[in-house]
């Protein structure tokens, strides 16, 4: 019997050496970066992760498929240390890396492991599909990657407490974008009984025209959503510590001069 052929998609396939990268990142995170998580079993995490989507049609993945993974990997983020981001991933990651105490989603174990990787399975094989995976334009919203990020984004937000931060891109026409993961999942998953304040850091490209984005209609929309959920909203244009990181690349820019 000839094996059935794989479904063909237009998107990039599973990242080469996926399992090795997954295990390697898991070990780096649990043994070096966060040794308090050294008891996590990376092999078990990998097999539970794969169990969510291997041997399944990659357009029919559900949130429930990832439930065993979320149950297996528990990680507590301290209150006041959660940083969301929207269209500002690179700067947010630079900030948490240097600052050392705050967490973006990609500073959690599952986020760290999966960041920038691609994966999918196929009903005809128990292996991963290294030929092609669904592209976002293929009318396949319930694919393994999208569902994974929605699930762990929601959990990350649900677990947040105290004062939470979000870094937004002030150089965009809509720094707060309704259809982003932050705008559609995370802000609505914050528990008003645990989170009392959301603070937006609206960062502008250092070379771009700087505007008072905090008073824009886009940020007003976020403010109203946050207030409707009974939380305090605050907004800072070009949060200074993050601005300093931008200045490392462009130290001569006028906004990088320290007032002496």
């Amino acid at each position: 019997l000839r094996p059935r052929s794989l479904l063909v998609w237009t998107g990039e396939p599973t990242t080469k050496h996926f399992s090795d990268i997954f295990l390697g990142r898991c070990l780096i995170y649990t043994q070096i970066l966060r040794p308090e998580m050294r008891d996590q079993n990376c092999q078990e995490i990998l097999s539970t992760f794969k169990g969510a989507f291997v041997s399944k049609n990659p357009c029919n993945i559900t949130r429930e498929d990832y439930a065993p993974l979320v149950k297996l990997v528990t990680q507590t983020i301290p209150c006041n240390k959660t940083l969301f981001w929207s269209k500002s991933k690179h700067l947010a990651h630079q900030y948490t890396w240097i600052q050392g105490k705050m967490f973006t989603l990609e500073d959690t174990l599952l986020g760290y492991i999966a960041d920038d990787l691609r994966w999918c399975g196929d009903p005809s094989t128990s292996d991963m599909n290294y030929v092609s995976c669904p592209h976002w334009s293929e009318n396949c919203p319930n694919n393994p990657i999208t569902v994974f990020w929605k699930v762990i984004s929601q959990k990350f937000a649900e677990d947040a407490c105290g004062v939470v931060q979000v870094m937004l891109n002030g150089s965009l026409r809509e720094p707060f974008y309704k259809n982003s993961t932050f705008g559609s999942v995370e802000v609505f998953s914050l528990d008003p009984n645990k989170v009392h304040k959301l603070q937006a850091w609206v960062m502008h490209d250092i070379e771009g025209a700087s505007s008072n984005a905090c008073s824009s209609s886009s940020l007003n929309e976020l403010k109203m959503i946050v207030q409707k959920r009974n939380m305090i909203f605050a907004c800072v244009d070009n949060y200074r510590p993050a601005r300093f990181l931008q200045c490392v690349k462009n130290p001569e820019h006028p906004s990088c001069r320290l007032n002496t």
């Epitope: 309704k178 705008g183 559609s184 609505f188 008003p192 009984n193 209609s217 109203m224 959503i225 207030q227 409707k228 959920r229 009974n230 305090i232």
Partner: antibody, heavy 121, light 108 residues
């Protein structure tokens, strides 16, 4: 069954006060933004006021009622209130309480049957 | 504040006919628009939200379309119980939420 039931309407003279109540049942009241919307006789709908979920820290009002009306909620009683002071003839209307959808978008998906307020000398 | 203008004011049609109601916003409201039905002596009932999503329990003869400033509500085949007043409402820029003036669909 999800239900909203208004009460407290009646006849009042200009300058007088009334307190409307809206009893909620069949859903977790504390999780929803609540609104008051009114409809003058033979006219269209006019939004009056909104209150945030949970403790109701934030409130919003139409310009026409700002400073005269106060919205509040008692989550222990699953009840929404509208305290109306300094009433005017133009406040005469049916007052509906309405629940906002608990989603990203904010249409009003559950309405009470309304209570009538008449302001006249 | 955003002004919503509904047209026509009154629509006279027979059961079984198709009804198209329009709502125009004075500025862009994206897809943040709802449609309500109100019968005499009753509270409004949500039909459509986010411009094109049918609310729970609403028959599929009701459909909404549009985005930005121009929206429409279509009733593909009018049933006797569909004769009522219809309101659009925007929730993009608030406070205040604003409603259109209404379109009355009456029996011809």
């Amino acid at each position: 069954e999800v239900q909203l039931l208004e009460s407290g309407g009646g006849f009042v003279q200009p300058g007088g006060s009334l307190r409307l109540s809206c009893a909620a049942s069949g859903f977790t009241f504390t999780n929803y933004v609540m609104n008051w919307v009114r409809q003058a006789p033979g006219k269209g709908l006019e939004w009056v006021s909104s209150i945030s979920i949970s403790g109701g820290r934030y409130t919003w009002y139409a310009d026409s009622v700002k400073g005269r009306f106060t919205i509040s909620r008692d989550n222990s009683r699953n009840t929404l209130y509208l305290q109306m002071n300094s009433l005017r003839a133009e406040d005469t209307a049916i007052y509906y309480c309405a629940r906002e959808m608990n989603t990203y978008s904010f249409p009003m998906d559950v309405w009470g049957q309304g209570t009538t307020v008449t302001v006249s000398s | 504040e955003i002004v919503l203008t509904q047209s026509p004011g009154t629509l006279s049609l027979s059961p079984g006919e198709r009804a198209t109601l329009n709502c125009r916003a004075s500025q862009n409201v994206r897809s943040d628009l709802a449609w309500y039905q109100q019968k005499p002596g009753q509270a409004p009932r949500l039909l459509i939200y986010d411009a094109s999503n049918r609310a729970t329990g609403i028959p599929d003869r009701f459909s909404g379309s549009g985005s930005g400033t121009d929206f429409s509500l279509t009733i593909s085949r009018l049933e006797p119980e569909d004769f009522a007043v219809y309101y659009c409402q925007q929730y993009y820029d608030w406070p205040p939420y604003t409603f259109g003036g209404g379109t009355k669909v009456e029996i011809k």
